[in-house]
Interface confidence: medium
């Protein structure tokens, strides 16, 4: 056959269906790949196809639209599942022609299982609310499309297991489930069961997410430098190893880029001679403040070293802090030799 | 397990119009220091029930209010003292009713706002 | 805001009676709505949640049905202890900038006991 446009297998979007739930599946063509969409496509002459490759085989097939109860089907650009089998598992294409073009893309589609708890391989979207911020909704994803709005379906919401009849602070409304007040202990997965009828029948969506409960812009702070600090001096004697760590406490900020970093003498480690080295850990609370503590090490240090200015530094979308270390070189002790000596008045 | 309402005084809370009053409600048999909802809500003489705040009896303390009350009306709660308060301000004859104070379900999965109510202050505004 | 509309008020019933109360919503509440009973001197007691959910201890001739805007209690086999003020309340989450929280009651509807 004529050269095709292949933009190879796309695992970008790695997508993931409920076995024996509805799965509508756009063709990534128009939505990654083209500057034009279906209709302006279709107009111009231009037919869509549809194949795919079992899953541990190499042969491409051709999509089998003529099944019982067209359980797979294709409207414009949407391939449709009504439902999804387990082994409809594979890699499908979506090729664009015509007589003298020709486009194509392959994307993973992986049916997953799961069990009476929703537990499964699916990667679950994450859905971050604030720490007793006010109402906050979380929506049910990815239900667009599936029905006509004169259809009503019935929405029933579970966290982890339990169906959420009505929690204290969690208030389920239609496709929203509405956080009167967040805290800690609404940490967990929620998933919406969406069930509507079609052509006498009845199909279920099942959509599960992560809520994680993080801290609240009302109590966020600039950087919080927690060492160095004026009371601790990094006194050294010439040879020893010098080790100052700067440990930076950062309130959770959606989106901020965190950011520490030490000076020395005003310029970054990098841009001087001495052999330094710098050894970054994180770590975060309950509710994603987060710690960076970043250790500034000179193994042997002079006394030239001793002298020079270390500053860490520390910026937030909150603002920016910086703290110099107290470095200085230690008054070596006399010798007792010598002192004894002086005490005889010897010369 | 039941909630005690105080507040009022002896004369069952008889109040000069423009005046203030603190009514309370403090949890016995539990505690709502496991952090609670702690609704009120008033019923004038022969009339329906009037929904006016509820507050989160918790390190928040995020409270909710019902847009008449325009800020005449602050909750406040005591986390060690288990209670949860209502303060009427700028009172006026209107605002005579019976005041009840209402918690939410015990337990996180039968949950409702309004599951355990107090016996109720009347509260009567008058020169 | 929202406004619940309670209907009808009052109504009678025979013992061993049927009572039916409807309450309407001005917004869509979904199953938000619970029921209550009020005896005079007494404060409210819940009977019903999340429209259909009974209440601890409350008996089976009590039932809840309704979602979204339109809401029914209905008491069978009514007992002459049953008489007594019945209140809806809708319950209604308002995302704006400070988020609201709306708890509104129906009027009210007296059932008088024959």
């Known amino acids: 056959s004529e050269r095709c446009d292949d933009w190879g297998l796309d695992t970008m979007r790695q997508i993931q269906v409920f076995e024996d739930e509805p799965a509508r599946i756009k063709c990534p063509l128009f939505e990654h790949f083209l500057k034009f969409n279906y209709s302006t496509a279709h107009s111009a002459g231009l037919t869509l196809i549809w194949y795919w490759t079992r899953q541990d085989r190499d042969l491409e097939e051709p999509i089998n639209f003529r099944l019982p109860e067209n359980r797979i089907s294709k409207e414009k650009d949407v391939l449709w599942f009504r439902p999804t089998l387990l082994n409809d598992t594979g890699n499908y294409t979506c090729m664009l022609r015509n007589t003298t073009y020709c486009s194509k893309v392959a994307f993973p589609l992986e049916v997953v299982q799961k069990d009476s708890c929703f537990n499964s391989p699916m990667k679950l979207p994450v859905h971050k609310l604030y720490i007793e911020y006010g109402i906050q909704r979380i929506t049910c994803p990815n239900v667009d499309g599936y029905f006509p709005s004169s259809v009503k379906p019935t929405i029933t919401w579970y966290m982890g297991c339990y169906k959420i009849q009505n929690f204290n602070n969690v208030i389920p409304e239609g496709m929203n489930l509405s956080f009167l007040i967040a805290l800690i202990s609404n940490n967990g997965n929620y998933t919406c069961v969406v069930t509507y009828p079609e052509n006498g029948r009845t199909f279920h969506l099942t959509r599960t997410l992560t809520v994680k409960v993080v801290g609240s812009p009302k109590n966020a702070v600039p950087p919080v430098i927690h060492s160095p600090n004026d009371h601790v001096v990094y006194e050294k004697e010439p040879g020893e190893e010098l080790l100052i760590p700067c440990t930076v406490y950062f309130s959770f900020l959606m989106d901020s880029r965190n950011e520490v970093w030490w000076t020395i003498d005003g310029k970054k480690p990098d841009d001087i001679t001495i052999d330094v080295t710098i050894n970054e850990s994180i770590s975060h609370s309950r509710t994603e403040d987060e710690t960076r503590t970043q250790i500034l090490s000179i193994k042997k240090v002079t006394s030239e070293d001793l002298k020079r200015s270390y500053v860490c530094h520390a910026r937030s979308a909150k603002g920016e802090v910086a703290k110099a270390a107290k470095v200085k070189q230690k008054v070596p002790a006399p010798r007792y030799t010598v002192e004894l000596a002086c005490g005889f008045g010897a010369t | 397990q039941q909630l005690e309402q105080s507040g009022g005084g002896a004369e069952g809370g008889l109040v000069k119009p423009g005046g203030s009053l603190e009514l309370c409600c403090k949890a016995?048999?539990?505690?709502?220091?496991?952090?609670?909802?702690i609704c009120w809500v008033r019923q004038a003489p022969g009339k329906g029930l009037e929904w006016i705040g509820c507050?989160?009896?918790?390190?928040?303390?995020?409270?909710y209010y019902a847009s008449w009350v325009n800020g005449r009306f602050t909750l406040s709660r005591d986390i060690d003292q288990s209670t949860g308060c209502l303060q009427l301000n700028s009172l006026t004859a209107a605002d005579t009713a019976i005041y009840y104070c209402?918690?939410?379900?015990?337990?996180?999965?039968?949950?409702?706002?309004?599951?355990?109510w107090g016996q109720g202050t009347l509260v009567t505004v008058s020169s | 805001a929202l406004v619940m509309t309670q209907t009808p008020s009052p109504v009678s019933a025979a013992v061993g009676g049927t009572v039916t109360i409807n309450c309407q919503a001005s917004?869509?509440?979904?199953?938000?709505l619970a029921w209550f009973q009020q005896k005079p001197g007494q404060p409210p007691k819940l009977l019903i949640y999340?429209?259909?959910t009974l209440a601890s201890g409350v008996p089976s001739r009590f039932s809840g049905s309704g979602s979204g805007t339109e809401f029914t209690l209905t008491i069978s086999g009514v007992q002459s202890d049953d008489a007594a003020t019945y209140y809806c309340?809708?319950?209604?989450?308002?995302?704006?900038?400070?988020?609201?929280?709306?708890?509104?009651f129906g009027g009210g509807t007296e059932v008088v006991v024959k």
């Open positions: 309340l809708g319950i209604y989450t308002y995302i704006s900038a400070d988020g609201s929280l709306y708890n509104a």
């Open positions: 507050i989160y009896v918790g390190s928040s303390g995020s409270t």
């Open positions: 209402a918690r939410d379900g015990a337990t996180s999965t039968s949950g409702h706002l309004f599951e355990l």
């Open positions: 016995s048999g539990f505690s709502l220091s496991n952090s609670y909802w």
């Open positions: 999340r429209a259909s």
């Open positions: 917004e869509d509440i979904y199953s938000n």
